[in-house]
Interface confidence: low
């Protein structure tokens, strides 16, 4: 809202201003009346019955000061010419507003020629007879402006040309854009310019503990002719450690913090932080708690997790399935991952070493998010120790590790995978395979077979190769076949028992 600086206020002066009337003793007259139980003064003229009126009322000299454009607000009432006998043919319902600039007060020396007309003032509503009877005069309000003014002061003058007018209020003022706090920037009181299209650009200054955000525009406003601030550009934000309270930046209270210049308020120190002092930009972590570099300052401080809670290693031939449960203490974080490492030991020598290169994991063993993994291609008759470590975003900030280990001995080779390669009415050709790392430990393969349903007798064939043809079999008969590796240390795991059928004599031609 524009600030009005009043230079002249007739209504507020209580009849004390003593304006000049011309001609003297005729025309305009200072009168007193009552409105709303208050005595009011007014300059009135009502020479409506005789023509050729030229009655002037001139204000006292008004010092301009810093004003460039002045605004003139008039409150007046005009009587309806038709309320006079015969409609008063010479009666008018308007008057004229003039002004004159000067560097000195001419006193009672009144010269019409010095005055420049501002406008003809006409009422929006005229006061008719019935309004008078009801004690209700139609008050009109008109405003005009003049500028730019350049001299030390000025006069206003009112010319009556035969109206019945009462001038109740003459207020002359200029406008300033008031001192303003906006967007945490202070804009000084600024005199409104005199040219309507122009807008004066005014730079603002950030209030205490406020800053222009990085990459942001410096605060600026534009002061319009009517004293209104327009087109705000840029803004200030409360710096780190301070928050906006009304139009100021206030230090964060103890126990609160703000880590950057932003519009957000101070936040309470998160969990596992030490109480912050006033104006804190962050809250330090309690001993044993940490912040990862990417953690926001608003996040509680956290710690590394405890070890995986429960770890099992279940051997299945030359495979091990590792299963574990999450740590009982996550450290306050959700970014837990697991790493699995493997160590193998030779029972004979007791020698141990890493075995990452020789085993195969069901998924990459580092950065695991699931709580199980299968390790295969294990060598028989070897002791394996598996370590599962739990880590989170702050584990790298401490030297200690959180892990659990499980050991398993691989006593057998993996069961061979058996295939039927061919068959006849009296023979079955069978082949098998085992993982290459285990083949070196195999001495021979033992093939056991028997007729299905005959549990009293079975046949055994041994071979060093990976296939065998079983002869002298009965036609159209189902045989149960199992292959087992033999090592220096004993038997390996047997394969599944497979059912293979010899051909019937009718189909032997195939």
């Amino acid at each position: 809202q524009g600030k009005e600086v009043v230079l002249l206020d007739f209504a507020a002066a209580g009849g004390e201003l003593g304006w000049l009337t011309h001609p003297y003793g005729k025309g305009w007259d200072l009168m007193q009346n009552i409105m709303n139980d208050m005595p009011i003064y007014m300059y009135s003229v009502c020479n409506v019955m005789s023509g050729d009126q030229d009655n002037w009322l001139r204000t006292n000299w008004v010092y301009r000061g810093e004003a460039e454009r002045i605004f003139i607000e008039l409150k007046f009432t005009v009587r309806d010419c038709n309320s006079f006998p015969g409609g008063a043919s010479s009666c008018k319902e308007t008057f004229n507003l003039y002004y004159a600039e000067s560097d000195l007060d001419y006193g009672t020396n009144f010269q019409k020629r010095l005055f420049t007309k501002i406008d003809t003032i006409a009422p929006d509503e005229i006061t008719v007879s019935s309004d008078f009877e009801a004690r209700h005069v139609k008050l009109n309000v008109e405003e005009r402006s003049v500028g730019p003014l350049t001299r030390k002061g000025f006069y206003l003058a009112f010319q009556d040309i035969g109206a019945c007018v009462a001038l109740l209020s003459v207020r002359v003022y200029y406008k300033k854009c008031p001192e303003l706090l906006q967007g945490l920037a202070h804009f000084p009181e600024t005199i409104a310019g005199s040219d309507a299209p122009s807008l004066a650009t005014v730079a603002g200054t950030c209030v205490d503990h406020a800053v222009v955000p990085p990459g942001g525009e410096e605060p600026r406003m534009h002061c319009a002719v009517d004293g209104e601030w327009l087109v705000p550009i840029g803004q200030c934000l409360c710096q780190a450690g301070y928050e906006k309270v009304e139009d100021a930046c206030q230090a964060c209270s103890p126990g609160f913090f703000k880590f950057e210049a932003s519009e957000s308020p101070c936040l309470e120190c998160p969990e596992h932080t030490l109480p912050s002092p006033e104006g804190a930009t962050s809250c330090e972590c309690e001993e044993g708690f940490f912040r990862a570099p990417q953690d926001p300052a608003s996040m509680p401080c956290t710690r590394p997790p405890s070890a995986p809670h429960y770890l099992t290693a279940v051997g299945m031939g030359a495979k091990v399935e590792l299963r574990w449960t999450p740590p009982q203490d996550s450290g306050g974080r959700e970014d837990i991952v697991y790493s699995v490492t493997c160590e193998q030991c030779w029972p004979e020598s007791g020698e141990c070493g890493p075995c990452e290169a020789s085993v195969r994991y069901s998924e990459p063993p580092h950065g695991l998010t699931r709580t199980s993994v299968t390790v295969s291609d294990l060598e028989p008759h070897m002791n394996y120790t598996f370590t599962v470590e739990a880590r989170n975003g702050v584990s790298g900030l401490v030297t200690s590790r959180s892990f659990r280990t499980a050991s398993v001995s691989i006593n057998q080779t993996e069961p061979p995978k058996v295939r039927l390669e061919g068959r006849s009415t009296t023979s079955l050709s069978v082949s098998w395979s085992i993982p290459p790392p285990q083949q070196s430990r195999v001495w021979k393969y033992e093939v056991t077979y028997r007729k299905k349903g005959d549990s009293n007798s079975y046949n055994v064939r041994r071979t060093e190769g990976f296939s065998v043809t079983l002869d002298d079999l009965a036609p159209d008969t189902t045989y149960l076949v199992q292959v087992q590796a033999l090592t220096q240390e004993g038997q390996g795991a047997g394969s599944k028992v497979h059912e293979f059928q010899t051909l019937s004599p009718e189909g032997s031609g195939n």
Epitope: M42, S44, F84, S130, E133, A134, H136, A166
Partner: antibody, heavy 126, light 112 residues
Framework: EVQLVESGGGLVQPGGSLRLSCAAS????????MNWVRQAPGKGLEWVSY????????YYADSVKGRFTISRDNAKNSLYLQMNSLRAEDTAVYYC???????????????????WGQGTTVTVSS | QSVLTQPPSVSGAPGQRVTISCTGS?????????VHWYQQLPGTAPKLLIY???NRPSGVPDRFSGSKSGTSASLAITGLQAEDEADYYC????????????FGGGTKLTVL
């Protein structure tokens, strides 16, 4: 014929209430302001209250302010005076009078109270 | 005590001229407010006699006239007649009073 007729007067005890009415005829009631004026026995005229044509402006004499209420019903061409907390000094003949308010511009006739009713008597006594 | 001061009584013989004065102050008559005169015949309601200082409503004989000067006003009656015997009141407006309407104390005119 332009006429104002008051009614509602009577004997009332101190502290009591009365409502006076004034019926207007023969003119456009809604265009005129109205007054109540009273005259104590053997005394002069004393203005009591004023109401503008639209009821937007109301005035009271200091002696009755807060006790009396003036009102009007333009649709019924009627003026009223509600009198509460009556005192012995309120005993008087009460007149309603049609009114033209004084203008502050020269050349404009001010008609004063140009039509009066016949009056109604209010006696406040224990 | 009335704001406007009138003589309590005046008298005159039939055919004579009498005047009744009404004295105010700078907050009423002296402030430019109009003065009105009312006639109250015995046992009747007041009747407007002079309005706006010197104007006669229709029906009022021209034997009655009013004038105003400074802070005072006066009512003149010429060719006094027996039916003129009555109480006469002046009325104006006072900017210092609530409601502004003021009456004089009244003057009893006796026709001898």
């Amino acid at each position: 014929e332009v006429q104002l007729v008051e009614s509602g007067g009577g004997l009332v005890q101190p502290g009591g209430s009365l409502r006076l009415s004034c019926a207007a005829s023969g003119f456009t009631f809604s265009s005129y302001s109205m007054n109540w004026v009273r005259q104590a026995p053997g005394k002069g005229l004393e203005w009591v209250s004023y109401i503008s044509s639209s009821s937007s402006t109301i005035y009271y004499a200091d002696s009755v302010k807060g006790r009396f209420t003036i009102s009007r019903d333009n649709a019924k061409n009627s003026l009223y005076l509600q009198m509460n907390s009556l005192r012995a000094e309120d005993t008087a003949v009460y007149y309603c009078a049609r009114y033209r308010f004084p203008d502050f511009w020269s050349g404009y006739p001010n008609y004063g109270m140009d039509v009066w009713g016949q009056g109604t008597t209010v006696t406040v006594s224990s | 005590q009335s704001v406007l001061t009138q003589p309590p009584s005046v008298s005159g013989a039939p055919g004579q001229r009498v005047t009744i004065s009404c004295t105010g102050s700078s907050s009423n008559i002296g402030a430019g407010y109009d003065v009105h005169w009312y006639q109250q015949l015995p046992g009747t309601a007041p009747k407007l006699l002079i309005y706006g200082n010197s104007n006669r409503p229709s029906g009022v004989p021209d034997r009655f006239s009013g004038s105003k000067s400074g802070t005072s006003a006066s009512l003149a009656i010429t060719g006094l007649q027996a039916e003129d015997e009555a109480d006469y009141y002046c009325q104006s407006y006072d900017s210092s009073l609530s409601g502004h309407v003021v009456f004089g104390g009244g003057t009893k005119l006796t026709v001898l």
